[in-house]
Interface confidence: low
């Protein structure tokens, strides 16, 4: 009998649901993996892939109702010719709580000594038209904003921004300002991922002189 995959787990972002597993020890070139999915409430395992040689599988298309369902469990077993292992099942229920929150993009512009930021929620192509980030997380959205100034030896963090827009009064400072954003939903336990850094340069020309 083949050994079972040691572990199976989901890594998910908004409408990007990837199942991962660790390979069995001493697998051969002909070893592949079978993937099955259980939707809570149905009581039935559905075969998704009979023979995947990769160590991950994109289950987004078959879990599109994740955000409006009771969740899923997945299982994986090794297959080598006519031999197969026991199933290894994900330890936890894959539900909305397991989705890591991300932002789509962060846009920065300069206006009269202020840096104005606009956070664009993720807009994955796979998401059904009615399932936007804002409709699924309709309340208690927050963003943590980390700002770094170059040159200058400080960073600072603006916490609890409750809107997709934010502003920074620069008090006459000039230089390059780099911003990262991490989303959260205060009523939920989802982890958030820091966005890639966006930078904007502020020079004297951006300040209006007032008497």
């Amino acid at each position: 009998e083949l050994p079972s995959p040691p572990s199976v787990w989901f890594e998910a972002e908004f409408f990007h649901h990837i199942l991962h597993w660790t390979p069995i020890p001493n697998q051969s070139e002909s070893t592949c993996y079978e993937v099955a999915l259980l939707r809570y409430g149905t009581g039935r395992w559905n075969s998704i892939s009979n023979c995947s040689q990769a160590l991950s599988y994109d289950l987004t298309a078959v879990t599109l109702d994740l955000y409006r369902s009771n969740g899923y469990r997945a299982r994986v077993r090794a297959v080598d010719g006519s031999r197969h292992s026991n199933w290894t099942v994900t330890n936890t229920r894959f539900s909305l709580d397991e989705v890591t929150l991300t932002v789509g993009s962060v846009k920065l512009e300069i206006h009269n000594g202020f840096i104005l930021g606009k956070i664009q929620p993720p807009r994955p192509k796979m998401a059904p038209a009615n399932d936007t980030y804002e409709s699924i997380f309709s309340h208690f959205r927050e963003y943590e904003i980390a700002i770094r100034k170059v040159p200058g030896n400080f960073t600072f963090t603006h916490k609890k921004v409750k809107h997709e827009n934010f502003s920074l009064l620069t008090s006459g400072e000039v230089g390059e300002f780099c911003v990262q954003v991490k989303p959260s939903v205060t009523s939920r336990t989802n982890k958030g991922m820091w966005s890639k850094e966006e930078c904007v340069s502020l020079t004297r020309q951006y300040f209006t002189v007032t008497n």
Epitope: K149, F154, F156, T157, H158, K159, K160, V161, L168, L169, T170, S171, E173
Partner: nanobody, 127 residues
Framework: ELQLLESGGGLVQPGGSLRLSCAAS????????VGWFRQAPGKGREFVAA????????YFGDFVEGRFTISRDSSKNTLYLQMNSLRAEDTAVYYC????????????????????WGQGTLVTVSS
């Protein structure tokens, strides 16, 4: 007049933790941006952390690297600095300070923006 009194300093081993407190008296500092600076022997004052009047915004010096957290309890008129993973180079006198403004601005990274200062509490990190 706003008076500030720090406490919680002392001797701690590298890797240890301390929690500094700053109690305000004379009047409430709930409408002030408040923060912590430090001064190591033979060096100038260095910005550590600050928090705005409503607690929505925090700032940290680069050297903090996620080791410190700043918080305030307006009902107790007290400011806190929780310091974890302390290093020998964190040895300094730590000062509590209060500014008069509320707007989130880079000016609060400069000691000249702070009108009120405490007497300081000494933190020594040594084995």
């Amino acid at each position: 007049e706003l008076q500030l009194l720090e406490s919680g300093g002392g001797l701690v081993q590298p890797g240890g933790s301390l929690r500094l407190s700053c109690a305000a008296s004379g009047r409430t500092f709930s409408s002030h941006t408040v923060g912590w600076f430090r001064q190591a022997p033979g060096k100038g004052r260095e910005f550590v952390a600050a928090i705005t009047w409503n607690g929505d915004t925090t700032y940290f010096g680069d050297f903090v690297e996620g080791r410190f957290t700043i918080s305030r309890d307006s009902s107790k008129n007290t400011l806190y600095l929780q310091m974890n993973s302390l290093r020998a180079e964190d040895t300094a006198v730590y000062y509590c300070a209060a500014a008069t403004g509320q707007v989130w601005s880079l000016q609060y990274l400069r000691e000249s923006s702070y009108a009120y200062w405490g007497q300081g509490t000494l933190v020594t990190v040594s084995s």
